[in-house]
Interface confidence: low
Amino acid sequence: QLPPGKPEIFKCRSPNKETFTCWWRPGTDGGLPTNYSLTYHREGETLMHECPDYITGGPNSCHFGKQYTSMWRTYVMMVNATNQMGSSFSDELYVDVTYIVQPDPPLELTVEVKQPEDRKPYLWMKWSPPTLIDLKTGWFTLLYEIRLKPEKAAEWETHFAGQQTEFKILSLHPGQKYLVQVRCKPDHGYWSAWSPATFIQIPSDFIMND
């Protein structure tokens, strides 16, 4: 029977910079029941606080609700593991909410085949930013990535759309049914999950771009 092994805070994420959650990995349990607590202070303050919510984020997590989330302060946090034989502490983790945002996927992805008379046909897609994201106050730029593939294909073709919320693709296989998805990330944060797939049938007379 031993003191617990050193825990590790391995991930913190915010959906919208208004709340965030951090997760830790326990170390070895030393063969005894082990209690975990997360404590934190805001940089520039000396007052230590305990995690306000161990429930919302699931096991081995700490959730910071709106009233505990400050956009403009760095959080310094650590996890304490304790059993009957002693304690161990994780390394301190510095968390700035600005840099841990992982938004929801973009919304309202629509895809159309455009066949102008005077030009080659193309696939046109547009989407909207996720509604939870406040695009101006806090941080400002969402970047988008599109992926598509014929329904039966194994490989995705990926296109970076920058800050645009619409995109054109010219090179497609006539007669194929394509799956199209889009995801987004703030410039300092993490990619969202891919949006639900939208399906589009490419007409058989679609002229390939040379």
Epitope: M71, W72, T98, P129, T131, D134, L135, K136, T137, W139, F140, T141, L142, Q163
Partner: antibody
């Protein structure tokens, strides 16, 4: 095309009240933060405050906090600025502005004059 | 509050000149900075957001740069319609604050 039209400006006595309105069109009003900005005659721009999409959060500059209240009615695409306990230094043109991803859009402003 | 300063406060230039306006923040604001142009009797117009990204429809002769505390707005070849007052504004933290403005007039 984004359009913002302010109204409600005019002459008010020191200590008096005014309510400014801003009607928005050309974008989905309910999905954006909105701001009020003012400009004293011949002076620079001063941010007054803003309001979150659903109206649940407002932020104000210290000089107006407790006297001014920002609100919105998303059903009517309208933004409001209730100004109480007006002072001479509140005189100026008041603009409403959208806080869009790609920069701001501004109304043409409404003039507020506080004088006895 | 974050203080924003601009220099120069005014400048005289000729059509075709290259003009640079500097904006400085009293603390680090990353690139949470906008530039606005205002003409007399008109509302401000957004030129640049996020310190360097040109607003749609703004001519490419305008450019912005900087990060942290020091920022610049450059007009590469001044046109008659560019004579105006230019403001920077930070939106890193509340209250948002504007610089005092730089008036660009005809030499």
């Amino acid at each position: 095309e984004v359009q913002l039209v302010e109204s409600g400006g005019g002459l008010a006595q020191p200590g008096g009240s005014l309510r400014l309105s801003c009607v928005a069109s050309g974008f989905t009003f309910s999905t954006y933060w909105m701001s009020w900005v003012r400009q004293a005659p011949g002076k620079g721009l001063d941010w007054v405050g803003n309001i979150k999409q659903d109206g649940s959060e407002q932020n104000y500059v210290d000089s107006v906090r407790g006297r001014f209240t920002i609100s919105r009615d998303n059903a009517k695409n309208s933004l409001f600025l209730q100004m109480n306990s007006l002072r001479a230094e509140d005189t100026g043109v008041y603009y409403c502005a959208t806080l869009l991803t790609k920069g701001d859009y501004w109304g043409q402003g409404t003039l507020v004059t506080v004088s006895s | 509050d974050i203080q924003m300063t601009q220099s120069p406060s005014s400048l005289s230039a000729s059509v075709g000149d290259s003009v640079t306006i500097t904006c400085r923040a009293s603390q680090d604001i990353s690139n949470y900075l906008d530039w606005f142009q205002q003409k007399p009797g008109k509302a401000p117009k957004s030129l640049i957001y996020a310190a360097s990204i040109l607003q749609g429809g703004v001519p490419s002769r305008f450019s912005g740069s900087g990060y942290g505390t020091d920022f610049t707005l450059t007009i590469s070849s001044l046109q008659p319609e560019d004579f105006a007052t230019y403001y920077c504004r930070q939106y890193k933290t509340y209250p948002f604050t504007f610089g005092p403005g730089t008036k660009v007039d005809i030499k």
